[in-house]
Amino acid sequence: EVEKTACPSGKKAREIDESLIFYKKWELEACVDAALLATQMDRVNAIPFTYEQLDVLKHKLDELYPQGYPESVIQHLGYLFLKMSPEDIRKWNVTSLETLKALLEVNKGHEMSPQVATLIDRFVKGRGQLDKDTLDTLTAFYPGYLCSLSPEELSSVPPSSIWAVRPQDLDTCDPRQLDVLYPKARLAFQNMNGSEYFVKIQSFLGGAPTEDLKALSQQNVSMDLATFMKLRTDAVLPLTVAEVQKLLGPHVEGLKAEERHRPVRDWILRQRQDDLDTLGLGLQGGIPNGYLVLDLSMQEALS
């Protein structure tokens, strides 16, 4: 055993190159200087080391940097990153977006591993907030990232970051998350003109209040039914038949197919049947003529 710890004559590594793939594990341990490895980490990726050999290289780096690797090494880890444990990564201080991208690239096509989850957490915490470039990067690799954040976490996302969000990034967001994201999107896109604004804001409308829907109804936006069906029920209920007709434009005919689904079903129940009949769609379930509608929620608010 003692003999194996000494590097055989003439085998001392002068640089990290392909000759090392022929080294046994104990030879790598004995003949490769950790400091040399650290300065030439960028070469490791180009060399077809076995998993066992990579374990040895990792062990050497761990011994050299017991408190955690410096970013200059982390950025060039390449496939060695897949050998890291969440505990290893918690020791790192990753501040460069280029480092984050390099490591996410290694994991590309794989599922979100505990290692990647830990890396992202460390990076975002280090940055202090989820800026646009970071969000852009994270959603490019993991489209569901944004919808994994709690409403509390989303509240710290600056409105400028919303420009990085694509419709597919919001696919699994729930109403509580959209309630937080919508005002940020409204602020981010406020200087756009009508039609461009609607294209950008459309994916966030699940968090829009009634007054914003009323405003949109005055802008000939022709909202499609899929978007309408994702609106908050409490935001849709106060809309008049005329406002819904203006909001949907030619898509208003689609209400018939959705009359048994929320929010259309609940909205129909709040409208006068006379008003619904003006649409000519055969929508049924409105308030019959001659009935008095009491808004009990308003009464409670006043008392």
Epitope: P143, G144, S150, P151, Q168
Partner: nanobody, 111 residues
């Protein structure tokens, strides 16, 4: 693509309970949270509950106080404990995490 498998659905009487599970494949971390959605016959898909990345939770008003979402990171699994089940809870329940969806598990509540 992340693989999610739901289980635990079945037939239960109104007022009864069920516990749904959603397990992620391989080494995937459930530390990024998950959500349960459901689709009742002839209806649109609707959100039920979420456990977010930071461990906090959220519920649709229709299930608040009756359903509880939780996760076990060691088992890469998210659970939905459903108590005081009602007829209107009948639906196919789907789990989603990081934009991936499971195949769903049927929950039927009978009178």
């Amino acid at each position: 693509q992340l693989q999610l498998v739901e289980s635990g659905g079945g037939l239960v009487q109104a007022g009864g309970s069920l516990r749904l599970s959603c397990t992620a494949s391989g080494s995937t971390s459930m530390s990024y949270g998950a959500k349960w959605f459901r689709r009742a016959p002839g209806k649109e898909r609707e959100w039920v509950a979420s456990v977010y990345r930071d461990g906090t939770t959220g519920y649709d008003d229709s299930v608040k106080g009756r359903f509880t979402i939780s996760r076990d990171l060691a088992k890469n699994t998210v659970y939905l404990q459903m108590n005081s089940l009602r007829l209107e809870d009948t639906a196919v329940y789907y789990c989603t995490a990081l934009n991936s969806w499971g195949q769903g598990t049927q929950v039927t509540v009978s009178s």
